[in-house]
């Protein structure tokens, strides 16, 4: 009986000769469970494993921790993949995290974080961060430290308030933060002078909500 | 939608006055806090005043403490920033700005810069002999 080819992140992938973009199939590290994943093989030299995806507001991001956890939404468009893959993956290996941002006004900015992982669900996914580069600000629009996942039904953030709740969007929110890539999508024209948007301060200032973001990871060794 | 709409701005003379106005539109004020906030040709933008009606608490720099005085009207949503003893280096844009009263952190009582979400498009205060 042949044993089935497995993968646990898109960089495996591009390394065994499939160099489509595309969705393809992982598989949890030291487990059977799969995860559908969009692999970005054009960006930077391929094999990036994209973990978010926002585009056009098709998708609710409004979820709970269950489903943040698990991940939603379709590999093709708007999705999150799921904190627990990505914690595993990440815990085991080192990666970088690379932010792709598009405004309204038809700029594209990236932020590279040298060093990235989730801990695990007993600490609320929280993340880490390392070596910030890139265009899309010389400071981390993600709070450094880095702080716990939150979400609608799971409050673990540092504010009197509950950010989760008030900016809509399971995220690293700090008291809340400068950032929020899960927020409420707004469209040209009405995405200035947001509370809620997808937001990244220091690249575009605050209450300005984003056009499009993905967030993708990819081996540091690769 | 929300909209911030400063007034008030002008040319003065080095210890005059000034009121500044922020109209504010598409929330109450009750909610939220409003800041004021100034840029410098060349400089980053600073907080210089911020008020919670809720509670009537204040904050000031310290650049500004016992000259600039803050102020909210809630019947007509519109927060004030009276400015006495101006001197050459208050000459900026001044901006007014909101955010969400309870964003705020554990054991703080003011907000950093990047939680005010909600921007008017700034007064210009030249303090000029």
């Known amino acids: 009986k042949e044993e089935k080819t497995t993968f646990r992140d898109c960089a495996e992938i591009f390394k065994s000769g499939l160099t489509t973009s595309g969705i393809y199939t992982l598989t949890f590290p030291n487990s059977t469970e799969e995860v559908k994943a969009y692999c970005d093989m054009d960006m930077g030299g391929g094999g990036w494993t994209v973990i978010q995806h926002r585009e056009d507001g098709s998708v609710d991001f409004q979820r709970t921790w269950k489903e943040y956890k698990e991940g939603f939404g379709s590999p093709l468009g708007e999705y999150w993949l799921g904190n627990e893959f990505v914690s595993q993956l990440t815990s085991g290996h080192r990666y970088v995290l690379k932010i792709q941002l598009k405004d309204w006004e038809g700029s594209e900015a990236h932020s590279l974080y040298e060093h990235f992982y989730l801990s695990g669900e007993e600490s609320n996914y929280r993340i880490h961060l390392t070596g910030l580069t890139g265009t899309a600000g010389k400071i981390s629009s993600i709070s450094q430290p880095g702080s716990d996942f939150s979400t609608k039904d799971s409050d673990n953030d540092k504010c009197i308030c509950k950010c989760s709740q008030m900016l809509t969007g399971g995220w690293w929110f700090d008291a809340c933060g400068p950032s929020n890539l899960n927020g409420q999508y707004y469209p040209q024209k009405q995405n200035t002078n947001k509370f809620n948007g997808i937001k990244w301060y220091y690249w575009k200032g605050s209450g300005y909500s984003l056009k499009a973001t993905t967030m993708m990871i990819r081996p540091a060794d690769f | 939608e929300v909209q911030l709409v400063e007034s008030g701005g002008g040319l003065v003379q080095p210890g005059g006055s000034l009121r500044l106005s922020c109209a504010v539109s598409g929330i109450t004020l009750d909610d939220y806090a409003i800041g004021w906030f100034r840029q410098a040709p060349g400089k980053e933008r600073e907080g210089v005043s911020a008020i919670r009606s809720s509670g009537g608490s204040t904050y000031y720099a310290d650049s500004v403490k016992g000259r600039f005085t803050i102020s909210s009207d809630n019947s007509k949503n519109t927060v004030y920033l009276q400015m006495n003893s101006l001197r050459p280096e208050d000459t900026a844009v001044y901006y007014c700005?909101?955010?969400?009263?309870?964003?705020?952190?554990?054991?703080?009582?003011?907000?950093?810069?990047?939680?005010?979400?909600?921007w008017g498009q700034g007064t210009l205060v030249t303090v000029s002999s």
């Open positions: 700005a909101a955010v969400p009263a309870g964003r705020l952190r554990y054991g703080e009582q003011w907000y950093p810069i990047y939680e005010y979400d909600a």
